[in-house]
């Protein structure tokens, strides 16, 4: 768990605290909430970024149509239970015992349920779409720059392999960025998609969790890409047990930024 | 050399309060986590909390989150812990100890709660 | 929390002899545990750190081996000064805990 060793400070992950007290006596960073020592190296999973949120003092149809199992997060914050590795448990419950399973981004997938509600497994989210609506500008992006400047960012910025960009559509002023990524696809060391996909969204929020970075400042061909509304689907590996209620009464959260 | 020197030893009534001091030498005070351990008699050690220099940063064993509160006062390189609402079972030696590992650990401090 | 239970509760040994402690944690902690050893009326005194990480000043016969879920501090010939309360601790995520210890007593 290395850090920035002149500094001891960790560029990834500004929700932590960090000192020299780690193995072999080099910089350790512990993400707030949880203690849990982070690898300052790559993002911190969105479990453990989200358990440090809670703690702090807090026409031609080129777009995709979510399927009828993809999931929003309408639940909103929560306080989750992290495994030793910083991933979600699969069964979350609050303070009240009420309980739910999620899948890996820590969305909810399940009815509420009490404290027997069993979850056997963490199911994959393995296509995530995050759909933008940018500010109205001059005139529409070129698609092509657009696409090159989206997959640049994810590479760069975030460390997300390529081929897990699978696809940038645009039909002004809407645009698609769609993640993919199988359990088997995933090697050690990869950047998750849920974990990219969150700190894209908190950037777009300007909330940015790296240390010391400014905020995201997306131009395309040196045009500012001002977003004003982001809604995030997660499709997960196995689709989610909800009852028929829930299903005909699917109400999809939306933030909104301005 | 690193040191960490604790405050004398105090006897308190049932429902008071008690304050404990630690101060450290001999290294960058706010760059190492500050923790506080308590022992009480013929028992083992038991974790209360940490507490990080630099800002403050502080975390409760959620045991000790209504009644505990850590400090620090970075000008003279000390740091402390109250202990509110005292009981009989609060009596122990408190420790403070540095870094994650507990490399140094004051002298400790015996808290006598009797009425 | 973080469970750790340390065996066995109390160990009979001679000096001269080998003796292994053990400490056993309640989910995987990579090797986030550090090994005290407290004598009465001291403070707890640091002997091994990170599960194998020797300790400056700490003599060579002290040695931490493990990772994951199960730990062994070993005192590869037991000096009559070596006879004292051993205590595991975890340092993986908050709360930090301690092992009830270990009493090495004195055959």
């Known amino acids: 768990h290395t850090a920035a060793q002149d500094n001891c400070t960790c560029p990834t992950n500004k929700m932590t605290v960090c000192s020299p007290d780690g193995p072999g006596g080099r910089c350790q960073c512990r993400a707030l909430g949880s203690g849990m020592a982070v690898d300052c190296s790559t993002l911190t999973s969105k479990c453990l970024l989200l358990k440090a949120r809670m703690s702090a003092p807090k026409n031609a149809r080129t777009l995709v149509r979510p399927s009828e199992h993809a999931l929003v997060d309408n639940d909103g914050l929560y306080d989750p239970d992290c495994d030793p590795e910083g991933r979600f448990k699969a069964r979350q419950c609050n303070q009240t015992s009420v309980c739910w399973c999620v899948n890996s981004v820590g969305v909810r997938r399940t009815d509420k349920g009490d404290l027997s509600l069993r979850c056997d497994e963490l199911v994959r989210t393995h296509h995530i779409l995050i759909d933008l609506r940018h500010r109205p500008t001059a005139g529409a992006f070129n698609h092509s720059d657009l696409d090159a400047e989206l997959r640049r960012l994810f590479r760069e910025r975030y460390r997300l392999h390529p081929k897990f960009v699978a696809a940038v559509h645009y039909e002004q002023p809407t645009i698609q960025i769609e993640l993919r990524q199988n359990t088997s696809q995933k090697a050690a060391g990869d950047v998750d998609i849920g974990d990219a996909a969150y700190y894209f969204e908190r950037d777009i929020k300007g909330e940015s969790l790296f240390q010391g970075r400014g905020g995201l400042d997306l131009r395309v061909r040196g045009e500012p890409l001002q977003v004003e509304r982001t809604l995030i689907y997660y499709l997960d590996e196995i689709p989610p047990k909800f009852s028929m209620k829930r299903l005909t009464h699917h109400h999809h959260h939306h933030h909104h930024h301005h | 050399q690193v040191q960490l020197v604790q405050s004398g030893a105090e006897v308190k009534k049932p429902g008071a309060s008690v304050k404990v001091s630690c101060k450290a030498s001999?290294?960058?005070?706010?760059?190492?986590?500050i923790h506080w351990v308590r022992q009480a008699p013929g028992q083992g050690l038991e974790w209360i909390g940490t507490?990080?220099?630099?800002?403050?940063?502080?975390v409760y064993n959620q045991k000790f989150r209504d009644r505990a509160t850590m400090t620090r006062d970075r000008s003279i390189s000390t740091a402390y812990i109250e202990l509110s609402r005292l009981r009989s079972d609060d009596t122990a030696v408190y420790y403070c100890?540095?870094?994650?590992?507990?490399?140094?650990w004051g002298q400790g401090t015996t808290v006598t709660v009797s009425s | 929390e973080i469970v750790l239970t340390q065996s066995p509760a109390t160990l009979s040994l001679s000096p001269g002899e080998r003796a292994t402690l053990s400490c056993r944690a309640s989910?995987?902690?990579?090797?986030?545990i550090h090994w005290f050893q407290q004598k009465p009326g001291g403070a707890p005194r640091l002997l091994i750190k990170?599960?194998?990480e020797s300790i400056s000043g700490i003599p060579s016969r002290f040695s931490g081996s493990g990772s994951g879920t199960d730990f062994t501090l070993t005192i590869s010939s037991l000096e009559p000064e070596d006879f004292a309360v051993y205590y595991c601790?975890?340092?993986?995520?908050?709360?930090?805990?301690f092992g009830q210890g270990t009493k090495l007593e004195i055959k």
């Open positions: 100890a540095r870094a994650s590992y507990f490399d140094y």
């Open positions: 001999g290294y960058s005070f706010t760059t190492h986590w």
């Open positions: 507490i990080f220099p630099s800002n403050a940063y502080a």
């Open positions: 989910q995987n902690i990579g090797t986030s």
């Open positions: 990170y599960a194998s």
């Open positions: 601790q975890h340092s993986h995520s908050w709360p930090f805990t």
